[in-house]
């Protein structure tokens, strides 16, 4: 027999199918030009020493073969002895290791069998009523097709499904959508209405995420506030990665899970922007403010469940960084400026009250004054920190106040509002005899002592009403008692106590008169 012809003789090997799992499969035959035809197939198993034979039986019952050697593709013309206008049955027999392996048969009319392509290019994936919808452009000149899909998960084998007949410039398929696992899909097409026409190759994998993105399982810590007033949010555990089917491993566009970090700065509510969303990989530096944090997972079908945290404010206070001067027109704060053209946010709230009751004020961008200080002033009429109580003050700074992650903490401290010098005056001053020339003076703690770091010291003043001599005694802010010694019996004295802050002298308490009785010896 000539090599270009189908040989109508017995093939040169015994006729017995080994029934082995390996062998030829996926035989496709079609017309490739006006008078030429091609059959191709796949061979599974070791290829060394394998010879392939394309078998053909005509409707008359006569059968022939083409010897393909080791190739898995064979072309022939309409003059090769195979009827192209009538139905023929074709299959492949592979002779290997002294045994024959057969492919499944295809029965078709070769002239009308067009080589169909699988879906090419971009396959759009969307969700429709809990199912997966795939859509693609019909390959050129191939309108009218039957379409099948196959799909698998990381733990399950291929399952076959049917998309039904297609007859348009775009084709589509409804497929099952898994809730919690990724899937790999492949599609194939064949000519519609052409009995026995061959299936195209399978398309490239289409990788589809689960309907629900995996819950983020991350762990955070926050570092201590640094000298620059910022602290780093650190990721202790990465989110778990989605398990992918075999064909989606490596680069799998479509199954990506995006993890985003949403920051909400709770402190300084008067600033322009309170929320910022970042990629989880980029861990931000934060000020010492309080924040709420969420990690949101999403895939092409939308967001999933999120994971949330609260980062408490850093309450480490700087007792000396803030100077406050109270004048007739109002109050001015001074603190070391951070840099040129900084916006400051001054936040205050009464101590012991819920964080939701904080008030704040935003300054215009300001440069340091000649002494290197930044300032904020307010009038008495504004009512700011006007009540005689302890306030917790935090000052934040940013050169870019619109960027949430560029705020830093300048200082946190306590301040006693209103008329602190009068409100802080100690009450219930009492004098008790201590010895023949000394007394013990006690008083109730000043209101200023409720405000950490505000009360610098008490001063106790003793005045000799005869000589008009005055002595003053400084007392630690934690003490509410002092012993006055070197006093003379029978002399009238007055004692007063005041409470001083670092920037303000207190008001003396009401004078308390006393004298040490003269001891008469028997």
């Amino acid at each position: 027999c000539r090599t270009s012809e189908c040989c109508f003789q017995d093939p040169p090997y015994p006729d017995a199918d080994s029934g082995s799992a390996s062998g030829p499969r996926d035989l496709r035959c079609y017309r490739i030009s006006s008078d030429r035809y091609e059959c191709s197939w796949q061979y599974e198993g070791p290829t060394a020493g394998v010879s392939h034979f394309l078998r053909c039986c005509l409707s008359s019952g006569r059968c022939c073969y083409f010897a393909a050697g080791s190739a898995t593709r064979l072309q022939f013309s309409d003059q090769a002895g195979v009827s192209v206008l009538y139905t023929v049955t074709l299959w492949v027999e592979s002779w290997a290791r002294n045994q024959t392996e057969k492919s499944p048969e295809v029965t078709l009319q070769l002239y009308n069998s067009v080589k169909y392509e699988p879906p090419l290019g971009d396959i759009k994936v969307s969700k429709l009523a809990g199912q997966l919808r795939m859509e693609w452009e019909t390959p050129d000149n191939q309108v009218g097709a039957e379409v099948q899909f196959r799909h698998r998960t990381p733990s399950s084998p291929w399952k076959l499904g049917d998309c039904g007949p297609q007859d348009d410039d775009t084709e589509s398929c409804l497929c099952p959508l898994e809730m919690n696992v990724a899937q790999e899909f492949q599609l194939r097409r064949r000519q519609l209405g052409s009995q026995g026409s061959s299936w195209s190759k399978w398309s490239s994998p289409v990788c589809v995420p689960p309907e629900n993105p995996p819950q983020p399982q991350v762990r955070f810590s926050v570092e201590q506030l640094g000298q620059d007033g910022r602290r780093r949010l650190t990721l202790k555990e990465q989110p778990t990665q989605l398990e992918l089917p075999e064909g989606c491993q490596g680069l799998a566009p479509g199954t990506e899970v995006t993890y985003r970090l949403q920051l909400h700065m709770l402190s300084c509510p008067c600033k322009a922007k309170a929320t910022r969303t970042l990629h989880l990989g980029k861990m931000p530096y934060l000020s010492g403010a309080a924040y709420n944090v969420a990690v949101i997972s999403s895939n092409q079908f939308g967001p999933g469940l999120n994971q949330t945290w609260h980062i408490p404010a850093d309450t480490h206070t700087e007792p000396v960084a803030l100077n406050i001067s109270v004048g007739t027109n109002g109050t001015t704060m001074y603190w070391p400026a951070r840099a040129q053209s900084m916006t400051y946010c001054i936040e205050w709230q009464p101590v012991g009250q819920d964080g939701g009751l904080a008030t704040c004020s935003l300054t215009a961008p300001q440069d340091p004054d000649p002494a290197g200080m930044a300032t904020y002033s307010w009038s008495r009429e504004s009512g700011a920190m006007g009540q005689e109580k302890c306030y917790y003050i935090t000052i934040f700074a940013s050169a870019h106040p619109e960027k949430l992650t560029l705020w830093s903490t300048v200082l946190s401290t306590y301040h006693f509002g209103g008329n602190a010098s009068a409100a802080g005056t100690p009450h219930h001053v009492s004098v008790k005899n201590h010895s023949l020339d000394s007394v013990s003076v006690d008083w109730a703690p000043s209101l200023l002592s409720t405000c950490p770091g505000v009360l610098k010291e008490y001063v106790v003043r003793c005045r000799d009403e005869d000589s008009k001599q005055v002595s003053e005694h400084p007392v630690q802010p934690t003490e509410t008692q002092v012993t006055l010694s070197g006093l003379r019996a029978g002399v009238a004295y007055t004692v007063q106590v005041r409470a001083d802050t670092a920037w303000l002298r207190g008001v003396w308490s009401q004078p308390q008169r006393f004298s040490i009785e003269v001891q008469v010896s028997d």
């Epitope: 819950q215 983020p216 399982q217 762990r219 955070f220 810590s221 926050v222 570092e223 949010l233 202790k236 709420n292 944090v293 469940l305 999120n306 994971q307 949330t308 945290w309 609260h310 980062i311 408490p312 404010a313 309450t315």
Partner: nanobody
Framework: QVQLVESGGGLVQAGGSLRLSCAAS????????MGWFRQVSGKEREFVAG???????YFADSVKGRFTISRDNAKNMVYLQMNSLKPEDTAVYYC??????????????????WGKGTLVTVSS
Amino acid sequence: QVQLVESGGGLVQAGGSLRLSCAASGGPFSGYVMGWFRQVSGKEREFVAGITGISSTYFADSVKGRFTISRDNAKNMVYLQMNSLKPEDTAVYYCAAVNSFGVIPTSPNGMDYWGKGTLVTVSS
């Protein structure tokens, strides 16, 4: 491995108070952020209150001003003081822990260790 055991649950009239305790063992307690969560049958577990190793606290809006959380690092204990209780506070209360610095998880999947829970019933 950290073990957590809750106690102090029970039946209380609306407006009353209860104090829940959580005893922790098996880890460097002061390094853990501790939290209380609650769950009503058939619903998601929800955050109630949390406390860091240095006793910074945070509360769910629904309990703010009524509940307080505290810890005793020397005794490896966390407490939830519940005042002005309402019928809607009825739930199983769980103590939870995570080894973290300065960040209080407010969703259950942020916690690594859980107690078995104690039932709080508030009758009207």
